[in-house]
């Protein structure tokens, strides 16, 4: 994402929303969409949603993936539909983890 100042009337994108923050909605609207994966108590936790504030997305999307968390960001309507964040493996696997989608 380019390091530009937010527009006065920023473009909003429809994004897939999956996870606890979505309530009972399966979509949200924001300036960026994301797909994330984190390891929580040995579980792979997948979430999708919106960065609703410009600065929040700017910071998070620039954070490089770590063994415990990865976030992929995009701009475009429903652009996170077919994105699944991946943890960096570097040839290593993480034993004792399970896949878990927060719905």
């Amino acid at each position: 994402m380019e390091d530009e100042k937010p527009k006065v009337n920023p473009k909003l994108y429809m994004c897939v929303c999956e996870g606890l923050s979505c309530g009972n909605e399966d979509h949200c609207e924001g300036q960026q969409c994301f797909s994330s994966l984190s390891i929580n108590d040995g579980f792979h936790v997948y979430q999708k949603g919106c960065f609703q504030v410009y600065e929040q997305g700017k910071m998070t999307c620039k954070t490089p993936p770590s063994p415990g968390q990865a976030v992929e960001c995009c701009q475009g309507d429903w652009c996170n539909r077919n994105i699944t964040a991946q943890l960096p493996t570097k040839g290593k696997s993480f034993p004792g983890t399970q896949n878990f989608h927060l719905e």
């Epitope: 009337n9 994108y13 429809m14 399966d26 609207e29 609703q52 429903w78 539909r81």
Partner: antibody, heavy 119, light 112 residues
């Protein structure tokens, strides 16, 4: 161009159910949320609920939860609303509406279905 | 539910004149994403409603610049300048910040 073509007017008996359709054209059906709105005669508008055609996910106004069921058929780009246990209070015009992107609200409306409940 | 109070109920205007419609919400319409989802619609006689203004002040495509929207928080206004015959009908505000979505009760714009 974007069009939402709704089924024709209906006269139904109290206690019956009705299923109305809304055929979308001129855009990618699964990319836009479809909402349904009720307009009673000479009155304002009431939001019934929405369906996400891509996922099938729905959200209902509590008032209509036991009355309306929203579905879609992706293959024909058609949204449906079934209304059950009809009473005279359900006599109204029902609109299907496309929820636009970029926060535009309801950008396209169907022509409406007039439902009359009478014995 | 968010209650949308729209005034006046009826608004007699002269052609070429100005009109102002108010919409007040029972709670703030600022969404967690910072946007305010307050929209304005016109329903001409015998037609479906049509979008005029979205997110408080943005004119929808094809809407003439004699329509303008303003406001913030809980207090919003639709202004019409140089009223034309095709502007007559029922005007509604809609909030889509909170579920359930709720409409104002409508304002009928008619010739004085």
């Amino acid at each position: 161009q974007v069009k939402l073509l709704q089924s024709g007017a209906a006269l139904v008996k109290p206690g019956d159910s009705i299923r109305m359709s809304c055929k979308a054209s001129g855009y990618t059906f699964t990319d836009y949320i479809i909402h349904w709105v009720k307009q009673s005669h000479g009155k304002s508008l009431e939001w019934i609920g929405y369906i996400n055609p891509y996922s099938g996910g729905t959200n209902y106004n509590e008032k209509f939860k036991s009355k309306a069921t929203l579905t879609v058929d992706k293959s024909s780009s058609t949204a449906y609303m079934e209304f059950c246990r009809l009473t005279s209070e359900d006599s109204a015009i029902y609109y299907c509406v496309r929820r636009g992107h970029d926060g535009t609200g309801f950008d396209y409306w169907g022509q409406g279905v007039m439902v009359t409940v009478s014995s | 539910d968010v209650v949308m109070t729209q005034t006046p109920v009826s608004l007699p205007v002269s052609l070429g004149g100005q009109a102002s419609i108010s919409c007040r919400s029972s709670q703030s319409l600022v969404h967690s994403n910072g946007e305010t989802y307050l929209h304005w619609y016109l329903q001409k006689p015998g037609q479906s409603p049509q979008l005029l203004i979205y997110r408080v002040s943005n004119r929808f495509s094809g809407v003439p610049d004699r329509f303008s929207g303003s406001g913030s928080g809980t207090d919003f206004t639709l202004k019409l300048s140089r009223v034309e015959p095709e502007d007559l009908g029922d005007y509604y505000c809609l909030q889509s910040t909170h579920l359930p979505l709720t409409f104002g009760s409508g304002t009928k714009l008619e010739i004085k």
